[in-house]
């Protein structure tokens, strides 16, 4: 029950996280114009990964896409790539985790297969979350660097063909959405990995065998002694010896995994 709850909660948390990563990637407010000490008040600029928007004092808002690829900073391209990789991995993870959910029965899928799928989706969610956090952090670092460069340029002279950036940019809402969403996806992934441990029959059962002397000879069946990993065929404690040989399960209560022949 706890495993199902952990898996289900991990799935829901990851789902919210990935929805957040998608929302953040599409948002226009990755960076917003810093209004402090800025003499230009007629326009307010905010920018996303894909386009720049200007809201004018009249209330009119216009957005334009960054149609050039070569003219854009490599860091912006890297952030775009990280966010897209995060979304793709997250989406695949969600698809895998739907089939891995313990509460959903698909044909005669064994618990071992579900455990493997849960672990796979968990790892995908973790990587997805890390990609989003990394992408947002790289962008935030870029803004901080740009902010201080702009501040320095603001107080330099204007002799000759000065090319300074007088508009400073600060963190937009999308950065916070991205950080939270990445964190949720990461947490969801960890929960899926924890759930996987509970789904997989972990113990290695070594069948302890007791031999009882009997009147007739005991036929030993070669290859009968098997170590079950929990992923093999002998998970139901079947008798694998005939005659006077009986498994300890018939005599003792539950053997621990440290009981050897």
């Amino acid at each position: 029950m706890a495993v199902t709850a952990c898996q289900g909660l991990g799935f829901v948390v990851s789902l919210i996280g990935i929805a957040g990563i998608i929302a953040a990637t599409c948002m226009d407010q990755w960076s917003t114009q810093d209004l402090y000490n800025n003499p230009v008040t007629a326009v307010f600029n905010y920018q996303g990964l894909w386009r720049s928007c200007v809201r004018e004092s009249s209330g009119f808002t216009e957005c334009r896409g960054y149609f050039t690829l070569l003219g854009l900073p490599a860091m912006l391209q890297a952030v775009r790539a990280l966010m897209i990789v995060g979304i793709v991995l997250g989406a695949i993870g969600l698809l895998v985790s739907i089939f891995a959910l313990k509460c959903i029965r698909i044909g005669s899928m064994e618990d071992s297969a579900k455990a493997n799928m849960t672990l796979t989706s968990g790892i995908m969610f973790i990587v997805s979350g890390l990609c989003a956090i990394a992408g947002v952090s790289v962008f935030a670092n870029m803004l901080v660097t740009n902010f201080w460069m702009s501040t320095a340029n603001m107080y330099t002279g204007m002799g000759g063909m000065v090319q300074t950036v007088q508009t400073r940019y600060t963190f937009g809402a999308a950065l916070f959405v991205g950080w939270v969403a990445g964190g949720l996806t990461l947490i969801g992934g960890v929960m899926m990995c924890i759930a996987c441990r509970g789904l997989a029959p972990e113990e290695t059962n070594y069948k302890a065998v007791s031999y009882h002397a009997s009147g007739h000879s005991v036929a030993y069946k070669p290859g009968g002694f098997k170590a079950s990993t929990g992923f093999g065929s002998n998970t139901k404690n079947k008798k694998i010896y005939d005659g006077g040989a009986r498994t300890e399960d018939e005599v003792q209560s539950y053997p621990s995994k440290h009981d050897y022949v």
Epitope: A42, V43, N45, V54, E56, T167
Partner: nanobody, 118 residues
């Protein structure tokens, strides 16, 4: 690369008028503002007037009601009509284009001297 060419500066009488023009050549990102800033010796640069690509206009407090900015988007040119000139209007006037492409970009002209004589 954007190049800005200013013209129209010079000597003007107290209460007189001058017309500055600034032509931008090169590829300019669609969202932008074009405008004028000035810097008197020993002073900080000061906003004179800007005209945005969307049609909004903003004037500096010291020139409101006296200066008029206009913009020709087809020619990528901005004009500053200065009237009722005062001695405190004496400064180097710089043409500026600020584009709102990724993290913004500023382009400045060489500056044109405006001197108001008594």
């Amino acid at each position: 690369q954007v190049q800005l060419v200013e013209s129209g500066g010079g000597l003007a009488q107290l209460g007189g008028s001058l017309r500055l023009s600034c032509a931008a050549s090169g590829s300019i990102f669609g969202l932008n503002f074009m405008g004028w800033w000035r810097q008197a010796p020993g002073s900080q640069r000061e906003l004179v007037a800007i005209a945005t690509s969307g049609g909004s206009i903003q004037y500096g407090d010291s020139v409101k009601g006296r200066f008029t900015i206009s913009r020709d988007n087809a020619k990528n040119t901005v004009y500053l009509q200065m009237a009722s000139l005062k001695p405190e209007d004496t400064a180097v006037y710089y043409c500026n284009v600020h584009t709102y492409d990724f993290l913004g970009r500023d382009y400045w002209g060489q500056g044109t001297q405006v001197t108001v004589s008594l």
